[in-house]
Interface confidence: low
Amino acid sequence: MMTGTIETTGNISAEKGGSIILQCHLSSTTAQVTQVNWEQQDQLLAICNADLGWHISPSFKDRVAPGPGLGLTLQSLTVNDTGEYFCIYHTYPDGTYTGRIFLEVLESSVAEHGARFQIP
């Protein structure tokens, strides 16, 4: 029975050219986390495997940094980075938990005047 819940940073916005931390947290379960996948819609960004460590997808290696913790740091943001991001927790014995984050990357002036810039 899956008793856990995923807490995420929810809907966040960041400034073009800046950085953002994507963070998920699995709570309310004693299941062992064997792996966390970070995906952007249908693209794999990164894998954090309990035994193998981090693997960053080559197409993102210049702009994605592992951590902090099981989170993911996106750097040099562009407007094209706007969209849904998923943290997929593979656990034993529970199975798979998925969290969703929506990131909106704003032009600098919009971010400054809109006061929507958030760091999780």
Partner: nanobody, 115 residues
Framework: EVQLVESGGGLVQAGGSLRLSCAAS????????MGWFRQAPGKERELVSA????????YYADSVKGRFTISADNAKNTVYLQMNSLKPEDTAVYYC????????WGQGTQVTVSS
């Protein structure tokens, strides 16, 4: 019990192609991650390619990007690794792994690329 059976390895000349298959039983590809690893003599086992839970998400090591293609057939519970433009440095034993955990491995299939 999870069982993974690789096939498709062999001896091929540089520039040639091979298609590896990994048939999984006791395990469903859906909502899981499958990976291909390789281990050359005297080297550590390295992740070559992986396919994500959605089937559309893929990972490739820099050394094989643009040459290797991973795919999955959920109906057959099989993962494939199409290897094109093979190089001598691709010579290794190739293993598939369930969910990249490192606790379920196949027996491996030898790939030898001659120059």
């Amino acid at each position: 019990e999870v069982q993974l059976v690789e096939s498709g390895g062999g001896l091929v000349q540089a520039g040639g192609s091979l298609r590896l298959s990994c048939a999984a039983s006791g395990f469903t590809l859906e909502n899981n991650m499958m990976g291909w690893f390789r281990q050359a003599p005297g080297k550590e086992r390295e992740l070559v390619s992986a396919i994500g839970w959605s089937g559309a998400s893929t990972y490739y090591a820099d050394s094989v990007k643009g040459r290797f293609t991973i795919s999955a057939d959920n109906a057959k519970n099989t993962v494939y690794l199409q290897m094109n433009s093979l190089k001598p440095e691709d010579t290794a034993v190739y293993y598939c792994a369930a969910n990249l955990r490192g606790d379920n491995w196949g027996q491996g299939t030898q790939v030898t690329v001659s120059s």
